[in-house]
């Protein structure tokens, strides 16, 4: 994992996350529910697992939320299609390292990406989609916590 | 207006180095990733890597890799691309390109920059 | 790297005429790819994005399809301001590859 650093701005994301995250939230329908909230599975994911579910979840955002989430706010859509730009440029640097066989998908890891997306699935899409979007920081707050993220001068 | 600036024709001898710049104006510098890409004459293009102007944070494509470097001055919203130990085959016309930024994201190299012709000539 | 090959590399249309650019990509690239537009001496121009997304401000007649490894540009009814090399560009994976380029002439 080591030689597997996501060279991004974590900083820059959270920054602009933290702008728009009270406007976002405050659009979640389904307060009581959760999507990555309280998953107790991401807590427990083994340095081993890492890798793979940071690209399965990166995969998760990319190919699902930011597809079908639907802004009308040009202010925060702008500041969301700049957090997802930044999600496509760490998905990429995953797949090298997974090009270099240093990103193997084990059956925990697995399992953990499966129990988001079914979480997902149980709510209409764009309620779902917002609700994902509002827990962004549970996320970002994970990949802190679990890479070593190289912040380039 | 939104513009990328490069800087003019270099001229240089084989094994020296040249660095292009490339200004941005008529948008935030620090929103947007920027690509190099160069073109041989009467060649196709080449890719030859990015840089994160927000954090400084670059990919280079393995063929230049310990040869290039890329920088930016955010102070003066500027990327720089600067190429070493050049050789006859790098002459080139090479270009700084910005990457979009959409929903759902994507890439693509939506502004371009006029261009830069670097000819490495003993 | 992955390779990309475009075909033909050259051909010759008529104004009117409907145009289509093959790009075959050595492995499987998803929707990771697009089209560009380059007249001498010019930079290029970005057409088609994400394989089929059409580019703010370029013409409808101009359009993309395909995933994986075949993808096609088409242009529906060639104009006189269409006749220039196009680009296909893969990045799916590093480093991102352009095909050859197919130059697309006067008949």
């Known amino acids: 994992l080591r030689r597997c650093l996501i060279s991004t701005d974590m900083h820059h994301i959270e920054e602009s996350f933290q702008e728009i995250k009270r406007a976002i939230q405050a659009k979640d329908t389904f307060p009581n529910v959760t999507i990555l909230s309280t998953l107790e599975t991401l807590q427990i994911i083994k340095p081993l697992d890492v890798c793979c579910v940071t690209k399965n979840l990166l995969a998760f955002y990319v190919d699902r939320v930011f597809k079908d989430h639907q802004e009308p706010n040009p202010k925060i859509l702008r500041k969301i299609s700049s957090i997802a730009n930044s999600f496509l440029y760490m998905q990429k640097t995953l797949r090298q390292c997974q090009e270099q066989r240093q990103c193997h998908c084990r059956q925990e890891a697995t399992n953990a990406t499966r129990v988001i997306h079914d979480n997902y699935d149980q709510l209409e899409v764009h309620a779902a989609a917002i609700k994902s979007l509002g827990e962004l920081d549970v996320f970002l707050a994970w990949i802190n916590k679990n890479h070593e993220v190289m912040f380039s001068a | 207006q939104v513009q990328l600036v490069q800087s003019g024709a270099e001229v240089k001898k084989p094994g020296a180095s040249v660095k292009v710049s490339c200004k941005a104006s008529g948008y935030t510098f620090t929103g947007y990733y920027l690509h190099w890409v160069r073109q041989a004459p009467g060649q196709g293009l080449e890719w030859m890597g990015w840089?994160?102007?927000?954090?400084?944070?670059?990919n280079y494509a393995q063929k230049f890799q310990g040869r290039v470097t890329m920088t930016r001055d955010t102070s003066i919203s500027t990327a720089y691309m600067e190429l070493s130990r050049l050789r006859s085959d790098d002459t080139a016309v090479y270009y700084c390109a910005r990457d979009i930024v959409v929903l759902p994201p994507a890439i693509g190299f939506d502004l371009w920059g006029q261009g830069t012709l670097v000819t490495v000539s003993s | 790297a992955i390779q990309l090959t475009q075909s033909p590399s050259s051909l010759s249309a008529s104004v009117g005429d409907r145009v289509t650019i093959t790009c075959r990509a050595s492995?499987?690239?998803?929707?990771?790819f697009g089209w560009y537009q380059q007249k001498p001496g010019k930079a290029p121009k970005l057409l088609i994005y994400a394989a089929s997304s059409l580019q703010s401000g370029v013409p409808s007649r101009f359009s993309g399809s395909g995933s994986g490894t075949d993808f096609t540009l088409t242009i529906s009814s060639l104009q006189p301001e269409d006749f220039a090399t196009y680009y296909c560009?893969?990045?799916?994976?590093?480093?991102?590859?352009f095909g050859q380029g197919t130059k697309v002439e006067i008949k």
């Open positions: 840089i994160n102007p927000n954090s400084g944070g670059t």
């Open positions: 492995q499987d690239i998803r929707s990771d």
């Open positions: 560009l893969q990045d799916y994976n590093y480093p991102w590859t």
